[in-house]
């Protein structure tokens, strides 16, 4: 299991249920790099933190998955959590 994957999971598990729901909704509309597709809405909304981490890594790989997760956290006003996630992935 990679460091970035662990860091993503750690961040998502630290969200409240309401925040995790908001994270998924923002993830649906976040601007993506060219060549990447959005995770399908139907699959996304029912996922827990563990499933969502797996899906983020399978869709975007670890490095970009962590960056994308950090950006969505920033969009939610969770800059500190985003910084911790990025620091953990760059250790």
């Amino acid at each position: 299991m990679g460091r970035a994957r662990d860091a993503i999971l750690d961040a998502l598990e630290n969200l409240t249920a309401e925040e995790l729901k908001k994270f998924k909704l923002k993830l649906l509309s976040v601007p993506l790099r060219e060549g990447y597709a959005a995770i399908p809405r139907g699959a996304l909304l029912s996922m827990d933190a563990l499933d969502l981490t797996d899906k983020l890594v399978s869709f975007y790989l670890e490095t970009y998955g962590a960056e994308l997760t950090a950006n969505v956290l920033r969009d939610m006003g969770l800059q500190e959590m985003a910084g911790q996630l990025q620091a953990a992935t760059h250790q």
Partner: antibody, heavy 114, light 107 residues
């Protein structure tokens, strides 16, 4: 158009405290602007869960709270000096991405004077 | 803390001129930069967010560009109502920080 409601003026004595209010929603920021100066971010509070973030520069003098029942955010500013005479704005972040401050109150002008 | 440096501090210009305002971040802030317009005795108003996204109702003569550390606000043909202070701000990291502002004045 969201309207953030703030009282217009407050006159307080040096060393005293003042509690500013703002009818708002979501993330509410507090921003200080001294006459002829730039903008300084004091901190923010999430009205739905009470999560706060502070600028360390203001942590000792500003306390951010929320009354969910009235959707009102407050900042209590304590031990005020003349340096704290400024306009204090509240602002919301409602745009889904990049966390800008898209709605601003009209500001409360605080004058610290004996 | 991330320092946002704006330049020039002020600009004197004529109506119809093209204006370029610059903002430099002390470290990489991705695209997490916004531009605000503030007229005398008024609250700031959001113009641009995410470095290049025009906010609802903002005229298309305002354009934002840049990423990482260097950002630009361009006004293609300045109008009388554009004479104001312009602030850039970053929302990449706490504390959120703003530049000192650029004042646009009439020549």
């Amino acid at each position: 158009q969201v309207q953030l409601q703030q009282p217009g003026t407050e006159l307080v004595k040096p060393g005293a405290s003042v509690k500013l209010s703002c009818r708002a929603s979501g993330w509410t920021h507090w921003v200080k602007q001294r006459p002829g100066q730039g903008l300084e971010w004091i901190g923010n509070i999430n009205l739905s869960n009470g999560r706060t973030n502070y600028n360390e520069k203001f942590r000792a003098m500003a306390t951010l709270t929320v009354d969910k029942s009235s959707s009102t955010a407050y900042t209590q500013l304590s031990s005020l000096t003349s340096e704290d005479s400024a306009v204090y704005y509240c602002a919301n972040s409602m745009v889904p991405h990049f966390f800008p401050m898209d709605y601003w109150g009209q500001g409360t002008s605080v004058t610290v004077s004996s | 803390n991330i320092v946002m440096t704006q330049y020039p501090k002020s600009m004197s210009l004529s109506i119809g001129e093209r204006v370029t305002l610059r903002c430099k971040a002390s470290e990489n802030v991705g695209s997490y930069v916004s531009w605000y317009q503030q007229k005398p005795e008024q609250s700031p108003k959001l113009l641009i967010y995410g470095a290049s996204n025009r906010y609802t109702g903002v005229p298309d003569r305002f354009t934002g560009s840049g990423s990482a550390t260097d950002f630009i606000l361009t006004i293609t043909s300045v109008q009388a109502e554009d004479l104001a202070d312009y602030h850039c701000g970053q929302s990449y990291n706490y504390p959120l920080t703003f530049g000192a502002g650029t004042k646009l004045e009439l020549k």
